[in-house]
């Protein structure tokens, strides 16, 4: 086994790294010079009172993923400057308040993944007045939240509780914290969800529920006594839900008067989209929800899925919708027409094709839509895509990147207000008049272009990296250009005259090209001090490709001999 000392390296700023080794104890000889100590992923099982005694200037201590099962009472007594303490994923089965008492500067504390049943007999965190981020709990043994657990904490930026196997929640336990910007709650079962919800509704701004089985969730009226909910965003992550329980969840969300954003990530819908409310249930009011995000929704019985028409009436006020990687192949025309306030629609990584897009973007569909993202779908014709979107009179931004268009016709029709078009990674090998003249931003990066000779009088930003261009575009065709990103092409040189011809250019990124380091090129690039302000990736990404004896060196460092520069 390697010696403990050999596994630790410290730089001159006192940043010490010793992670992913075979350390079985904290290295001896640590001094006040140490500011940050990372000993994660080792085999430390024990921390003694003397291990960190001299580390009075320590600001960060990371001990995640060791086998620590014992910390002596005064182990942290000299760590008054400590701001970041990570003890996650160890074997601490009993937490002691004496560890944390001296840590008056602590802003981050992670205790996740340790096998304690409760957060101890006394209030662990009452002395931690500067604490901003707290992570507690574990997935199998943490079964009880007590009223004293969070006493003394008034404000937290983030609170993560892994209560996967929670069996007991003492009412008002979480109510003692006056404000939590983001609460992340891991719960396998929903049994105690409503009790917790009642306590956090007036103190949490963003509530995130993870790993919960809501298949049998039933909403029963809350005894809140108050309706002034602070929750602005509710996220469901890796949650299971059914048609019926989704309706119950919506009733719960109804209690949140100021809810603006709703997010479902990696969720499973064990249903067919039959959301018809039973007669005795009052109609759900979506309230002020403006943003709906759904990512990687899994619907096992996808082939039986309904058209969601029962929910159409709830969508009229929504302004932003993202449904990503969820096998969407159609947004029915009627739904599109109901989405009257929709300004932003992201359908990335789905199954949209032109024929169905035509139905989705029917007459009067998405009347307020400004941004449409159809990245990585199954679109194949630029001409048809542009034509299909003509109904969207307010559309200004279109992202159809990562669709395989291959070719581009000579002419296309596009919505008349178009300002932004993303055609990156679409396998196109030429650009034509199909690209609208109204554009201000064009992204054609990662394609097979070897020429760019389009006249785009209003274009301000051109992204054309990872292509096969051999020269900079003609500046006269792009009179308004402010930003040009053309890295990783086949450009061998550019001149002062070329750059000066871009009268309005503020930013150029041209690194990663195969520069011929001629005397002219070197003198121009090395003498122009102002160049560094324009070239945002200078000097690191500007390397010589030839002459061969300077290949791989940075352009700014290369010096050619007098004889090489004065050959006749």
């Amino acid at each position: 086994e390697s010696s403990n000392q050999a596994s630790l390296s410290c730089d001159r700023n006192g940043i010490c790294k010793g992670s992913s080794g075979s350390l079985n104890s904290i290295p001896s000889g640590l001094t006040e010079a140490v500011k940050s100590l990372d000993l994660s992923n080792n085999r430390i099982t024990y921390i003694s009172n003397s291990d960190l005694q001299r580390c009075v200037n320590l600001q960060a201590l990371v001990l995640t993923s060791n086998g620590i099962n014992t910390i002596e009472e005064d182990s942290f007594s000299s760590l008054g400057s400590l701001e970041h303490l990570d003890l996650s994923y160890n074997y601490l089965s009993n937490l002691s308040s004496s560890w944390f008492k001296p840590l008056s500067s602590l802003t981050f504390l992670n205790l996740l993944g340790n096998p304690y049943k409760t957060l101890g007999e006394t209030s662990l965190f009452s002395h931690l007045t500067k604490l901003q981020i707290l992570r507690v709990g574990n997935m199998d043994t943490f079964t009880k939240i007590q009223r004293k657990d969070f006493a003394g904490l008034t404000f937290l930026e983030e609170l993560e509780i892994d209560a996967s196997d929670l069996q007991s929640y003492e009412p008002k336990s979480l109510k003692s914290i006056q404000n939590v910007s983001h609460l992340i709650l891991h719960m396998k079962q929903h049994i105690l969800l409503l009790e917790i919800f009642v306590d956090v509704t007036s103190s949490v701004e963003c509530l995130e529920l993870r790993d919960t089985d809501l298949d049998t969730f039933h909403f029963s009226e809350l005894s809140t006594g108050e309706t002034n909910s602070l929750i602005k965003k509710f996220t469901f992550r890796n949650v299971k839900i059914t048609d019926e329980s989704l309706f119950q969840v919506m009733k719960l969300l109804n209690q949140i008067s100021g809810l603006l954003e709703l997010e479902f990530d990696d969720c499973t819908l064990n249903g067919v989209g039959n959301f018809r409310a039973s007669d005795n249930d009052r109609v759900i009011d979506p309230g002020k929800v403006e943003t709906l995000t759904i990512r990687r929704l899994h619907i096992p019985r996808f082939y039986l899925f309904y058209d969601l028409s029962t929910l159409y009436s709830l969508t009229e006020r929504v302004k932003r919708i993202t449904v990503e990687n969820s096998k969407v192949f159609l947004v029915p025309c009627l739904l599109s027409q109901h989405l009257k306030s929709l300004e932003y629609l992201d359908l990335s990584e789905n199954l949209m094709v032109e024929e169905y897009l035509k139905n989705s973007a029917c007459e009067d569909a998405w009347p307020s839509l400004q941004t449409l993202i159809l990245r990585q779908n199954h679109l194949a014709s630029l001409e048809k895509t542009g034509e299909t979107l003509l109904t969207l009179k307010n559309l200004t931004n279109i992202d159809i990147s990562k669709n395989s268009f291959h070719s581009m016709p000579e002419t296309c029709q596009w919505p008349e207000k178009m300002k932004y078009l993303n055609l990156s990674s679409t396998r196109i090998h030429s650009v034509t008049g199909c690209i609208p003249k109204t554009l201000e931003i064009l992204d054609v990066s990662n394609n097979n272009l070897n020429l760019f000779s389009l006249n785009l009088p209003q274009l301000k930003e051109l992204y054309i990296s990872r292509n096969k261009l051999m020269t900079l575009p003609d500046a006269s065709l792009l009179p308004m250009l402010l930003v040009l990103k053309i890295s990783r092409n086949a450009i061998t040189t550019f001149s002062k005259e070329q750059l000066d011809s871009f009268h309005t250019l503020k930013t150029l990124e041209a690194g990663g090209n195969n520069f011929i380091c001629s005397c002219e090129f070197l003198s121009f690039t090395q003498e122009q001090q102002a160049l560094a302000k324009v070239l945002i990736d200078w000097p690191a990404n500007y390397l010589c490709d030839s002459p061969s004896h300077v290949r791989g060196q940075q352009v700014q460092d290369v010096r050619l001999s007098v004889s090489e520069c004065h050959r006749t």
Epitope: N24, N41, N42, R43, I44, T45, Y46, T64, S65, N66, G67, N69, T70, S88, Y89, N90, Y91, S93, N94, L112, G113, P115, Y116, M139, D140, T141
Partner: antibody, heavy 120, light 112 residues
């Protein structure tokens, strides 16, 4: 040098009980989680039960839950497996195995095993 | 429970051969701490298993460098770059990311 020595195996009738012991030496026993792993004759390895170094948190395979109890005596550096209501399918070589000192660092040292035969 | 499936179940090889054993898990073995808990063990007849590799690719001390582990998520590989006479044994993969801990069914490496 780390050593784990199992004992207590033998022939027992179905429904009977047996208590296995594992004497540990060469390391600070109380600092490490320990497990029992078994291997039926001619078959593969099957994890049976685990116990953490301190605090007594235990975990069991479904096949033995409610019948077997893992425990430890840190003062004696000994791990135990109390086996009740034994069945023919519990016949196996039982190994005690030590965790390596890291998190979920299974299993850096094993004993030589003790054979348990359940037969009438 | 997480199922661990090894292939092949057995193989015949000669000294000096490059041997590859694969192990596939029914769920991802990436734990919430970011680590992937997949170990490889070697067992010779009548002996206790011996750990060769922990956390996918880390060799235990004393294990020859001809043994290497690789993979991520649900697909893992143990490679013996040049088989030696003492390497003829049964090899097991084991996942430590989820309770209960589970082993593959084993791969027996025999002399051709």
């Amino acid at each position: 040098e780390v050593q784990l020595v199992e004992s207590g195996g033998g022939l027992v009738q179905p429904g009977g009980s047996l208590r296995l012991s594992c004497a540990a030496s060469g390391f600070t026993f109380s600092n490490y989680a320990m497990s029992w792993v078994r291997q039926a004759p001619g078959k593969g390895l099957e994890w049976v039960a685990a116990i953490y170094g301190r605090g007594g948190y235990t975990n069991y395979a479904d096949s033995v839950k409610g019948r077997f109890t893992i425990s430890r005596d840190n003062s004696k550096n000994t791990l135990y497996l109390q086996m009740n209501s034994l069945r023919a399918e519990d016949t196996a070589v039982y190994y005690c195995a030590k965790e390596g000192g890291g998190y979920r660092d299974y299993f850096d040292y094993w004993g030589q095993g003790t054979l348990v035969t359940v037969s009438s | 429970d997480v199922q661990m499936t090894q292939s092949p179940s057995s193989l015949s090889a000669s000294v000096g051969d490059r041997v590859t054993i694969t192990c596939r898990s029914s769920q991802s073995l990436v734990f919430s701490d970011g680590n992937t808990y997949l170990n490889w063990f070697q067992q010779k007849p009548g002996k206790a298993p011996k750990r060769l590799i922990y956390k996918v690719s880390n060799r235990d001390s004393g294990v020859p460098s001809r043994f290497s582990g690789s993979g991520s998520g649900t697909d893992f590989t143990l490679t013996i770059s040049s088989l030696q006479p003492e390497d003829f044994a049964t090899y097991y993969c084991m996942q430590g990311a989820h309770w209960p801990l589970t082993f593959g069914q084993g791969t027996k490496v025999e002399i051709k």
